[in-house]
């Protein structure tokens, strides 16, 4: 026996004293353990385990399945094992035909031997079909035969173990080897919505998608800042081999305004870990935001167009959208549509175009939206910039001459002195009196300015132009002065357009 | 050619030492456990001892008649075994047998011719 | 120790007979039992291991039978190099002993 120290414990001895014995099908397994200390026999083989706490295991008569390693143990925890092959002609192999395979790992296909003492122990394809080239093994008659680094393309390879007995090869039940995948990426994860816009008391369901090649991916739904475990519901799928596919639902039936916050769906694997965030707000009631994309006070000149423009934000989704003016609701030339086609768009545009503005269209015209929840309405004061227009040029009975004048901005009246037939009036002439007739009436369209002066400063025979101007342009009347004795005659008055 | 052969044997005062070897060719030595095995002139044989392989660690046996006195070794890499024979008696004359153990069962498949150790003053 | 048993210590018999002999463990060695036959000056041969399986070489005309205590070796038709004195043995438990042998010589 090897060398042991008095007083230390050794392992149990085993008679026969062998390592490996062959016995014959139908013999008894007779073995005996020596040890003061004796405690158990233990049987293994596959994932079979027997014990017997006899310090002789007697198996009457032998059978295939009695092949396997038998061990003694004693009180101190030490062993000794034999391994006990039964030679059965008829039955060469024990087999567990489940055979599972981790990428790019070693997996064992069960089929230890009855007879270790047969030849050429492999494995062959089935059908007479060859293995892939690559597939490398090594054979163990006691646990069968490793693949060594098992490929995905070996993925449902139909395979026997085999040995030759007597000269004649002879095939194990068939073993269909089911590869693992390994990971070798993150999972790829995506959300239903990557918002949400939620009623207090409105169902919040959001779906988290997650695609790995096995479901041995592990997801959850977390809410950030928050250890609460969140209700979730799956719905998988395999779509192939390696295409496996998730569907993680989080539902919370009766949304309340503190559930507001961001989700975040996480998933990880092996390789690492990936995540996807929604957020979900939740308002006590609907909303509508309107934003001018313009000033709300527009000035255009006479003639041009003009677009009213808004964006606004409406939750729920907008029922009821109008363009009114003096009252009067605008059936063409208004579109409203949303700012994106996204599926949780709440931003909603809406343009009004105005064309060829006339003078007298300058006024409010309002916006006015609604949903379920509420109204809302936004106003655009127009002002139209007309050129002055002389409406009246006179000489009163007493003397005064008289120019009234109407147009947007307020018009400035000039007026000017031409001696004789001379046709640039140079010398200014101050009014004796400027009036704004129209400043207290409707607040938008044209605007007349009354300016009068006394004719009876003029000596001589000339002309006396009133020149009226805004921003937009200009428009002048001429007073035509002759002198006959002592009386002054108003000739022809005309007015002259200067761009 | 599987066989063994056995020397070293020879005559030998009672109380001195013998050694014997017994080397091994045509198969693998060391997947084998070794014994020796002795026939007295004229009598039956005799089991002396064993000693197991690497998978047995090497454990030895051997019979009440031998043990303390004799030591059995082996060499796996000269594909010898040895017995180591010390303080001999007359009663130790015998022809010493070196014998094979097949792999998977306690018989002696394969044996030496034989060495005679002759111990007499 | 087991003891052997072996009986007859010898037997006459002639070519062509059948040949009969036993052997007595003093414990059951359920098959742990092996059967030898030995010429003078020469090693002995392995016949018959586990109590019945033949070593590879040896002719059908050798068998072994019993287990547990009790066991035979037959030789079914002797021939005239069966002449040889026959050595059971147990390999149950070291020490593992031999019968003190059967001689079998020619009547």
């Known amino acids: 026996q090897p060398s042991v120290s008095p007083g230390e414990p050794s392992p149990p001895s085993i008679h026969p004293a062998k390592s490996e014995l062959i016995v014959r099908v139908g013999n008894e397994i007779r073995l005996l353990c020596i040890d003061p200390g004796f405690v158990k026999w233990t049987f293994e083989i596959l994932d079979e385990t027997n014990e017997n706490k006899q310090n002789e295991w007697i198996t009457e008569k032998a059978e295939a399945t009695n092949t396997g390693k038998y061990t003694c143990t004693n009180k101190h925890g030490l062993s000794s094992s034999i391994y006990v092959f039964v030679r059965d002609p008829a039955k060469l192999f024990l087999v567990d035909r489940s055979l599972y395979g981790k990428e790019d790992n070693d997996t064992l296909v069960r089929c230890p031997l009855t007879d270790p003492e047969v030849t050429s122990y492999s494995l062959k394809g089935c059908q007479g079909k060859p293995l892939p080239k690559d597939l490398r093994f090594v054979p163990d008659p006691k646990a069968g035969i490793t693949i060594k680094s098992v490929k995905r393309a070996y993925h449902r390879l139909c395979l026997h173990c085999s040995a030759d007995q007597e000269g004649k090869s002879v095939l194990s039940d068939k073993f269909i080897l089911k590869v693992r995948p390994a990971f070798k990426a993150v999972p790829v994860v995506s959300v239903s919505k990557a918002s949400y816009l939620l009623r207090e008391g409105e169902e919040f369901t959001v779906t988290c998608t997650i695609k790995d090649v096995s479901s041995s991916v592990y997801s959850t739904w977390k809410r950030e800042n928050s250890q609460t475990k969140l209700q979730e519901k799956y719905n998988s799928w395999h779509h192939g081999d390696f295409n496996y596919e998730r569907q993680a639902t989080l539902t919370i039936s009766s949304a309340r305004v503190n559930d507001s916050g961001v989700f975040m769906c996480y998933a990880n694997n092996t390789f690492g870990s990936a995540n996807v965030t929604t957020t979900l707000e939740v308002v006590d009631k609907g909303f509508i935001n309107i934003f001018p994309m313009i000033n709300t006070t527009v000035f255009v000149n006479d003639g041009e167009n003009v677009d009213l423009i808004v964006e606004y934000e409406a939750f729920p989704k907008p029922e009821h959208q109008q363009w009114i003016y003096m009252n009067r609701t605008f059936t063409d030339k208004w579109e409203d549509y949303p700012k994106s086609e996204n599926e949780s768009n709440i931003r909603y545009v809406s343009e009004l175009h105005l064309t060829r503005l006339k003078g007298t269209e300058g006024g409010t015209y309002t916006f006015l939206v609604s949903n379920s929840d509420v109204n809302a309405s936004i106003a655009f004061n127009v002002y139209v910039n007309t050129k002055p227009e002389i409406l009246t040029y006179d000489r009163l009975v007493n003397g005064m001459l008289q120019c009234v004048a109407a147009g947007f901005p307020e018009p400035t009246i000039d007026w000017y002195f031409c001696p004789g037939t001379e046709q640039r009036c140079s010398a200014s002439v101050l009014p004796v009196d400027v009036q704004t007739l129209n400043a207290s009436g409707p607040p938008f369209g044209k605007l007349v300015v009354q300016s009068s002066i006394d004719s009876s400063a003029f000596k001589h025979n000339g002309t006396v132009e009133c020149k009226a101007y805004n921003d937009v342009g200009k428009t002048s009347a001429y007073f035509n002065f002759a002198f006959k004795g002592n009386n002054k005659e108003q000739i022809h008055p005309h007015t002259l357009f200067t761009p | 050619e599987v066989q063994l052969v056995e020397s070293g044997g020879g005559l030998v005062q009672p109380g001195r030492s013998l050694r014997l070897s017994c080397t091994a060719s045509g198969f693998t030595f060391s997947d084998h456990d070794m014994n020796w095995v002795r026939q007295a002139p004229g009598k039956g044989l005799e089991w002396v001892g064993r000693?197991?392989?690497?998978?047995?660690?090497?454990?030895?046996e051997y019979a009440a008649s031998v043990k303390g006195r004799f030591t059995i070794s082996r060499d796996d890499s000269k594909n010898s075994l040895y017995l180591q024979m010390n303080s001999l008696k007359t009663e130790d004359t015998a022809v010493y047998y070196c014998?094979?153990?097949?792999?998977?069962?306690?018989?002696?498949?394969?044996w030496g011719r034989g060495t005679l150790v002759t111990v007499s003053s | 120790d087991i003891q052997m048993t072996q009986s007859p210590s010898s037997l006459s018999a002639s070519v062509g007979d059948r040949v009969t002999i036993t052997c007595r463990a003093s414990?059951?060695?359920?098959?742990?039992l092996n059967w030898y036959q030995q010429k003078p000056g020469k090693a002995p041969k392995l016949l018959i291991y586990a109590a019945s399986s033949l070593q590879s070489g040896v002719p059908s005309r050798f068998s072994g039978s019993g287990s547990g205590t009790d066991f035979t070796l037959t030789i079914s038709s002797l021939q005239p190099e069966d002449f040889a004195t026959y050595y059971c043995?147990?390999?149950?438990?070291?020490?593992?002993?031999f019968g003190g042998g059967t001689k079998v010589e020619i009547k």
């Open positions: 414990q059951s060695i359920s098959s742990y």
């Open positions: 043995q147990q390999s149950y438990i070291a020490p593992y002993t």
């Open positions: 014998a094979r153990e097949p792999k998977y069962w306690i018989d002696f498949d394969l």
């Open positions: 000693t197991r392989n690497a998978a047995g660690s090497y454990t030895t």
